[in-house]
């Protein structure tokens, strides 16, 4: 940055190089150039010469004043007009930053996604600070009192192998930047209570033309957790409101869920699960689309039909790549 230049003098900022956004600030420039009594001192912000609010303090020093400075970053430098010099002479430069102290981190959440081998902790950092803000995640065993700290700039993944102080911990987050420091409340966790089962995935759907047509959704998870509660939500793509069905699930085999749906309508399905009685849900699965056939199904694609046991016809949808869920962060 501009701070690496060779200086023939000194530039400084009051109250500080990093300051609260919206403050009034003063930038001082003091020349120390051999054989030069500056006729004039000039200030530049991001390469553009400033015209106003410049005060000459003495023969070698001038001040530039800004009211209500709102730019997150700016490069400042100052120059001198020296007698017998055709060009301005560079005195010095400085990068300045404005921003806010951190808010108190809240909504601290830690979960273990099954098979990940990590505990993932996230939090709400609050308003944008505009300046470099670091977070220290503290994890303290309620059994051994041992504490581990992890420095990060956003969320953190902590290897569960490193959590050797038993099952019960306190977790809290400390936020710090040049303008201040804040700390969250302490979250008490038990490692067995924060496991989120392996993702549930909808693999295919078929509509069977029985007396009353029904749609079967096939879905599965690789979870080894025995007691799992799931929700499947579905709606016509033209609707705003979701319908939700709840299931107590045993994933020793592929799940089949039956729905009686309107004909000739495109539906979207999502599923999510949690360990029964625990706090955290999976994010909703990827969107799965399925269009129900007309009342008397029209055979439109060989790929999506085959004979079924009730002599009806089947219209099927198969999961390939799906759009990502609009609620992937919904774990509360």
């Amino acid at each position: 940055g501009i701070t690496n230049i060779n200086c023939s003098g000194h530039i400084w900022v009051e109250p500080a190089t990093i300051f609260k956004m919206g403050m009034n600030i003063s930038i001082y420039c003091q020349a120390a150039i051999k054989n030069c009594q500056p006729r004039k001192l000039h200030f530049y912000k991001n390469g553009i010469k400033e015209r106003f609010q410049i005060t000459r303090i003495n023969k070698t020093t001038a001040r530039l004043w800004y009211k209500n400075f709102l730019e997150p970053h700016a490069s400042m430098y100052c120059t001198a007009e020296c007698p017998k010099h055709f060009q301005e002479t560079l005195i010095c430069g400085k990068d300045i930053s404005s921003g806010y102290p951190p808010d108190i981190p809240d909504e601290v959440t830690c979960v273990i996604y099954e098979y990940s081998g990590n505990m993932t902790c996230t939090w709400n950092a609050g308003k944008l600070t505009y300046i470099d803000t670091k977070y220290v995640v503290h994890v303290k065993s309620l059994e051994t009192e041992e504490e581990q700290q992890y420095l990060t700039s956003s969320y953190i993944n902590i290897s569960t192998d490193s959590l050797q102080g038993g099952k019960k911990y306190l977790v809290w987050v400390q936020a710090a930047n040049a303008l201040g420091m804040e700390e969250s409340k302490q979250l008490q966790i038990h490692l067995d209570d924060i496991v989120i089962p392996s993702a549930a995935v909808i693999s295919r759907a078929e509509t069977i033309n029985a007396t009353v047509p029904k749609t079967i959704i096939y879905w599965d998870s690789q979870t080894t957790i025995e007691k799992v509660s799931c929700e499947m939500r579905y709606k016509a793509t033209t609707n705003q409101t979701w319908n939700v069905k709840e299931f107590d699930t045993n994933f020793t085999y592929v799940q089949q869920s039956e729905f009686y749906l309107e004909p000739n309508i495109k539906y979207v399905f999502q599923v999510r699960c949690q360990e029964t009685g625990k706090r955290y849900w999976q994010p909703w699965s990827s969107l799965f689309f399925h269009k129900t056939p007309e009342t008397v199904p029209q055979v439109t694609s060989k790929a999506f039909q085959h004979d079924t046991w009730n002599s009806g016809l089947t219209v099927a949808s198969i999961s390939t790549g799906h759009l990502t869920s609009d609620n992937r962060g919904d774990i509360g």
Epitope: V136, H138, L142, E145, E146, Q149, Y150, L151, E183, Q186
Partner: antibody, heavy 121, light 112 residues
Amino acid sequence: QVQLQESGPGLVKPSETLSLTCTVSGIDFNSNYYMCWIRQPPGKGLEWIGCIYVGSHVNTYYANWAKGRVTISVDTSKNQFSLKLSSVTAADTAVYYCATSGSSVLYFKFWGQGTLVTVSS
Amino acid sequence: DIQMTQSPSSLSASVGDRVTITCQASENIYSFLAWYQQKPGKAPKLLIYSASKLAAGVPSRFSGSGSGTDFTLTISSLQPEDFATYYCQQTNRYSNPDIYNVFGQGTKVEIK
């Protein structure tokens, strides 16, 4: 045998900076640990000054009465910890202790014997 | 700011007496509390940590109890070497920007 040894001048002039070093031997420090400084003014109770956490990063914590005046630092290669307290007054006259458990707990199994620092002109 | 309030500030007791000292935290500190014994001219000595765990080499007449905000140190049968000053210390967290002191004010146990 665990030993914590505080060292530094016993007399400091008002407005100057008090500087103490704690040299630790006999402790196999864990990967994460706390080292703390505590003081005790004559005839009074224990006063926490601050701690340094040493792990994958270094973090310092100070009592709010000492903020802006105190700096705690570590030289891990020498197992030495230092305390600097600036702008001292007569109220900073005390026995200064360093203390640790050699791990990342905040109770102290091991203490130095303490060193008396007098602030006087 | 977590504040530690210890009581009484002093007490007189005889050898063989059961002595109880209490410590109250201004907020929940779980079981993160330690007790120390200090004799004149000496550094403090750890007696109890995690509210109720006896430190190595400490006689079993010393015991600690409590969690959350209220804690107790009990000496079941006071011995001549137990006359000293006792301090509680919260060991929950020091990262809070507003901590003034982590120790209680101390309780001096004197001979009656």
